[in-house]
Structure formats: C-alpha cells, structure tokens
Interface confidence: low
C-alpha cells in the first residue's frame, strides 16, 4: 500500500517514542563510533522533519524514501571521513547501493571500550534526573556494540530496564535490587543478539528461501494445530520483517512486527491455543511474548508421515510439480510432530529427503529407492542426541566453569590460530549451554542445545570472516548453516598448526588480578589456558588439569598474601617453570 510520505506513515504507525528510539538505534548501528550527543541531534532533526510530513504529506522531501532521508542525514556529518574513513565513500553512491554500502561497513566487533555499569547510586541519580536521556544512552550503547540487534526487541529490553530502575531506585539497598535484575536482563539481551545475528547471517549468506525454511520449521513446532497455509503466511511475514531489520530498515521492521502480532492475536483460533496471555499485553510485550510462547499441544491422531511422503504413489509427481510446496509440507508435517528436535536437525532431515527424491525420482523404480528414506534419518537424529547426552553428562560432572575449560581445550585444539579473546568468548558462551539447556526436561534438551550452539558458532564465524586465520574454521563457516554444528563437532585437532613459541610474559600475572570480579578472574585464567594449549596443542587432559590446578592455587595464595606483588614476582616464575616441565 503506497503512502505519499513513507516517513509520515511510519511516524503515525509507531508513535513518537518508538519512532525516536528506532531512529536512534538505526544511526547507532550504522555509525558505531559517534558519541550519543551527535546521534541525538540527528534523531531530533529527523523527528522534527517527520512531524512536518505528518502535518503535510506534500511538503518538500516528504515523498523521499527512508533510505534516502537517513542516508542523506548520515552523509551530511562533517567529520564522517575523519571518523569512519572509507565508509564515507558510500556517500558517493546512489540508493540502493549507498544503503548496501553502509550495511557492509557494520562492524560486529567494534573497537569500543567494554561497557562498564556505573554504581547503583549514580545510575539512579541520572535515571531520576532524566529518564529519557538515561534510556537513550542504553539504546545507543547496546546498538553500537551489536549492530544487528533486533531493533523492536531492543525497545522491549529498554522498557524492562526502565521498569527495573523505577522499581529499584526507591529501595534502600539499590545495588542489591538492581545488580541481579540487570545481570539477568543482560544475559537475555546477549542471547537475543546472537540469535538475531544468526538470522541475519542466514539471510545474507543463503537468502530468503533458507530463512523461510527455518521459520516454517520453528512455527510448525510452536503451532502444530495451524494448517500449512497459516504456517506459510506466518513464515512469509516473519521472513519479510526479519529481512527489514537485518537490512537496517528498522521502522518498517518494527511496524510489520506489530502488524504480525496483531494478525496472530486476531486469528488465534487457527494458530494456537497458547496465545491469549500474550495478546492481552501492550505492543512490545505482546510481540516479545509471542516470540517466546510455548509450543501448543500436538493435535490428536496425527497420521503417519509415510502415507503422504513415502507410500503415496504420486510422491515423485507431487515433488516434480511443486518442489518447494511439497518439501515445505514435508518440513511442516515433520516439525509439528517433533517439538523435541532442533530446527537445525529438522532442516537436515528435509535436505536428506530432498536429496533422496532428487536421486530416486530419476530411477526406474523410484518407490523401491526412496522406500526406506525415513529409516535413513536415524543416524542424523542419533548424532545430535549423542552430542547432547555426552555434553550434559560432562557439564553435570564438571560444573559450568570446568565445562567451559573442557571446551576451551577442545576448541583451541580444533582452531589454535583463532585469537585468544575469541576462543575464550566462544567457549564461555558454549559452556553456558549447560545451565541453560541441560537442566531442562529430556524432550526440550536437544532443541535448546543445538539451536543455541548454532547461534554461538555463527558468532565465531562472523568474527572469523573479518580476519580469517583457520582453514578448518573457514571450511565449517562457508558451508550450509545447518551443517555448521556437526562440522565443528567433527573437526579434528589441527595437525597443520605450528605450536606457539613459549613466552614467559604471557603467563606472568600481577597483584591487580586479585581485585577483579570473579568472572573476570576466570576469564584471565581461561585466557592462560588457551595460551597453554596453543603452546602445547598435544598436552593431555590430566597434564592441563595439573597445570591449571597449580595456577589456581598460586592465585589464591598470592591474593591472600600480605605483600601480594612480592608473592606474584617470587612465585610466578617458579610456576611458569614447573608448568613448562609438567607439559614437556
């Protein structure tokens, strides 16, 4: 539906508050180094302009596309070339190439200082002085560090943040109230970030068809009572709005997301019996709630899949005449029966089914050829099930920190060329799968584990793409998204790697480590573990455990000492020497 003024249309649909938030996110995700104040100035100018267009849609420039309007704003920044170098070259291009150029310059790992949370008193003071500015800073800081964060969802997290501040700033012990709540919010937001990045990667690398298949599988699991046409409609709409958000079209994305939520709530009867509680909420909470809604109960008496997809005499005819529709119905029917499978596994099964039909339908007796296709799924199903079982057992035995360390060793041996910070981040995140998924009932473990790991490995791939260093990682990252996790799991120790030369300073620590929070202390120790494996990639588990144990004891001893620095400089070299000997 054409509107005379796109910007007026979006302003009216979204309302001023959400409009301003989304424009701020958009600018922060494109120009990640600009200070907050500079972005706010741009946001206010765009908002004032939108208001003039709402008043008169025929006013000058109101008919311009959002890409043109936003791009012109960015390109008008006088310091653009000084701050961003070659990104300024985008401004010489015409739309849509200019917008594509901006997108290419988004940096998944911007060189920004880690965000340090101020103390509770200071936060409450600034929140109470100006809540709008306080929340604006939050949107800006998250968006610039996570340039693909799902914008309407970031508005939801900002709302949650604001509610926490409102609640806790009235408490006597503000810190005790704020800290655990914001820690939990941060965990959720980071998980949301890696999940959205996987969606954007899937769209960028493999296009709409691949993402739509993911959406069909996920929606079919969630809404097994909905018919295929309904699932297709939902998947199509979700694909469109996800593409918009990944493409930086945040106003359209947020508007379409609200529309999709409205549609789902108006058509609950043909979608799911679990939506009502979500549908009673305001727009941001409603969309968030719908995205996390539990799977509906399976319909009773679902017929065997074999009837339509193996035994039917017209399988090859149906496949040949409408491949995507036929494979779509297969994926739908399989997924709705298997909420206990990961989406990645369901897509691998659909791919196997497609490959089998491609081969068999060209043969003299197709049904004899594809007759056992469903049995041939067994190894594909067993592989991730075994992975979940083994890893959850290891997690239960070692606890989260120990499990992370086991993963550090495993992944450093697979890809020792990858930077130490990336390996530590990846292993720590992969290690969180234990407390996130292994605690769930059996039927929910596999989808939780594999789909979570897929998102974390995508982050590894995105960072590795920027500076490729490992052929093994490149091999797994350039293949299909659904094959990534099995590919990484199957990677052997990299035999081509030349061990890193031993440098004593890598393992030299000082008293400042003692004052770090426990999490950061762990990360320092884990970085040392990565370096140990890079130095001795063939070191055995017991050897590494011994060294790590001695290292932990050394830290405990020196951090309790009267003269900490003296202890570090006296015992440190001894530890380094004994570690070298233990690994010889």
């Amino acid at each position: 539906d054409a509107h005379k003024s796109e910007i007026a249309h979006r302003f009216k649909d979204l309302g001023e508050q959400h409009f301003k938030g989304l424009v701020l996110i958009a600018f922060s995700q494109f120009l990640q180094k600009c200070p907050y104040e500079e972005h706010v100035k741009l946001v206010n100018e765009v908002t004032d302009f939108a208001k003039t267009c709402v008043a008169d849609e025929s006013a000058e420039n109101c008919d311009k596309s959002l890409h043109t309007l936003f791009g012109d704003k960015l390109c008008a920044i006088p310091t653009l070339r000084d701050s961003y170098g070659e990104l300024a070259d985008c401004c010489a291009k015409k739309e849509p190439e200019r917008n594509e150029c901006f997108l290419k310059h988004k940096d998944d790992h911007p060189n920004l200082p880690p965000f340090v949370r101020p103390d509770a008193e200071a936060m409450c003071t600034s929140f109470q002085e100006n809540a709008v500015t306080f929340m604006g800073h939050y949107l800006h800081e998250v968006a610039r560090r996570h340039p693909y964060f799902y914008a309407p969802e970031l508005l939801y997290y900002a709302e949650k943040y604001s509610a926490i501040m409102t609640e806790c700033c009235g408490e006597a012990d503000k810190a005790a109230c704020i800290t655990p709540k914001l820690d939990a919010l941060k965990e959720k937001a980071l998980a949301s970030s890696v999940n959205q990045r996987l969606k954007c990667s899937s769209l960028q690398r493999f296009g709409q068809r691949a993402f739509k298949a993911w959406a069909v599988a996920r929606m079919s699991q969630k809404f097994p009572k909905a018919d295929f046409a309904e699932i297709t409609k939902l998947a199509t709409d979700l694909t469109k709005l996800t593409e918009e958000c990944c493409h930086g079209d945040l106003l359209e994305c947020a508007d379409d997301r609200a529309e999709l939520a409205k549609y789902m709530c108006e058509n609950q009867a043909s979608i799911s019996s679990k939506l009502q509680a979500c549908c009673d909420k305001p727009v941001l909470k409603k969309s968030h709630c719908l995205s996390e809604v539990e799977n509906d109960d399976l319909p009773a008496d679902l017929p065997s899949l074999a009837a339509d997809f193996v035994e039917d005499k017209e399988v090859c005819k149906n496949y040949a005449e409408a491949k995507d529709v036929f494979l779509g119905t297969f994926l739908y029917e399989y997924a709705r029966r298997h909420p206990d499978y990961s989406v990645a596994l369901l897509l691998r099964l659909a791919k196997k089914y497609e490959a089998t039909l491609e081969k068999c339908c060209a043969e003299a007796d197709p049904s004899a050829c594809y007759g056992k296709v469903l049995d041939e799924f067994q190894p594909l199903v067993e592989e991730p099930k075994n992975l979940v079982k083994a890893n959850c057992e290891l997690f239960e035995k070692l606890g989260e920190y120990g499990f992370q360390n086991a993963l550090i060793v495993r992944y450093t041996q697979k890809a020792p060329q990858v930077s130490t910070p990336t390996l530590v981040e990846a292993a720590r995140n992969l290690g969180k799968v234990g407390s996130k998924c292994c605690v769930l009932p059996e039927a929910q473990r596999l989808p939780c584990v594999e789909d979570y790991i897929s998102a974390i490995l995508n982050r590894v791939c995105v960072l590795h793409e920027k500076t490729p260093v490992s052929e093994q990682v490149t091999k797994c990252c350039t293949g299909s998204v659904v094959e990534r996790r099995p590919c990484f799991s199957a990677l052997p120790v990299d035999e081509t790697y030349v061990p890193k030369e031993f440098k004593a300073e890598t393992f030299t620590f000082h008293a400042d480590i003692c004052s770090l929070p426990e999490k950061e202390k762990q990360m320092k120790k884990q970085a040392a573990l990565v370096e140990l494996v890079k130095h001795k990639p063939k070191a055995t588990g017991p050897q590494l455990r011994t060294v790590l144990g001695e290292f932990t004891a050394f830290l405990d001893k020196c951090c309790k000492a009267e003269d900490k620095e003296a202890c570090f400089s006296e015992d440190g070299p001894k530890l380094v020497a004994s570690s070298q000997a233990a690994l010889a």
Partner: nanobody, 114 residues
Framework: QVQLQESGGGLVQPGGSLRLTCTAS????????MSWVRQAPGKGLEWVSA????????RYADSVKGRFTISRDNGKKMLTLDMNSLKPEDTAVYYC???????ASQGTQVTVSS
C-alpha cells in the same frame, strides 16, 4: 504444477442457488487451508470464505454469512461453495485460492440478474 480449476458458475435469478466447485492438483491438498475470493466488475478482490485444512474451521465474510456454505473433500481434492439466496451484488468472477493467496486461475463467472 499447482492447478486450481473452478466450475459451476452461470446466470441465475435473484433468490436462486448455485454450487461452485474447485478441483485441485499438483500439491498436497489436504495440508492447505483454502479460500474463495471474488472480483465484481470494476472492483477489487473481495474475500468470501475460508476453510481450514481438515475442514473443521470455516469463516465467512459478513456479506455472505448465512447464505453461503464452504466445504471440502480431501479424498477428491475438491473445494465447494454452496450459494443460496443469491443477490445481484453477488455478481462477480469467483476464484478458489490456496490459503489466503492471490488468484492463479481463470475463475468462474457468476451473474445474478432478472
């Protein structure tokens, strides 16, 4: 090739009845919700009625409620629209469509006139 073939249209007097049928091929009919839509001369497309894949859920536009009945036979891959108490404003080309999709067939002409 997905194919939908409508039939049963014709000229009928106001108050009369018609039965439209749609025969489907080239896709797994029983997995899809289906709809009837219509287009009157010089007007846009208007949704008329929809039915879920298993036939349990039926929906109607306010303008046809109580007069039209949608049904399906998954074994025969057939969709039906029974139209009673027809009015001149029901005059249009009627199309059957998959889900809530756009017409991809010829349709069948229904003319209600005395």
């Amino acid at each position: 090739q997905v194919q939908l073939q409508e039939s049963g249209g014709g000229l009928v007097q106001p108050g009369g009845s018609l039965r439209l049928t749609c025969t489907a091929s080239g896709f797994t009919f029983r997995s899809f919700g289906m709809s009837w839509v219509r287009q009157a001369p010089g007007k846009g497309l208007e949704w008329v009625s929809a039915i879920s894949a298993d036939g349990s859920d039926k929906r109607y536009a306010d303008s046809v409620k109580g007069r039209f009945t949608i049904s399906r036979d998954n074994g025969k891959k057939m969709l039906t629209l029974d139209m009673n108490s027809l009015k001149p404003e029901d005059t249009a080309v009627y199309y059957c469509v998959i889900g809530r999709g756009s017409p991809a067939s010829q349709g069948t002409q229904v003319t209600v006139s005395s």
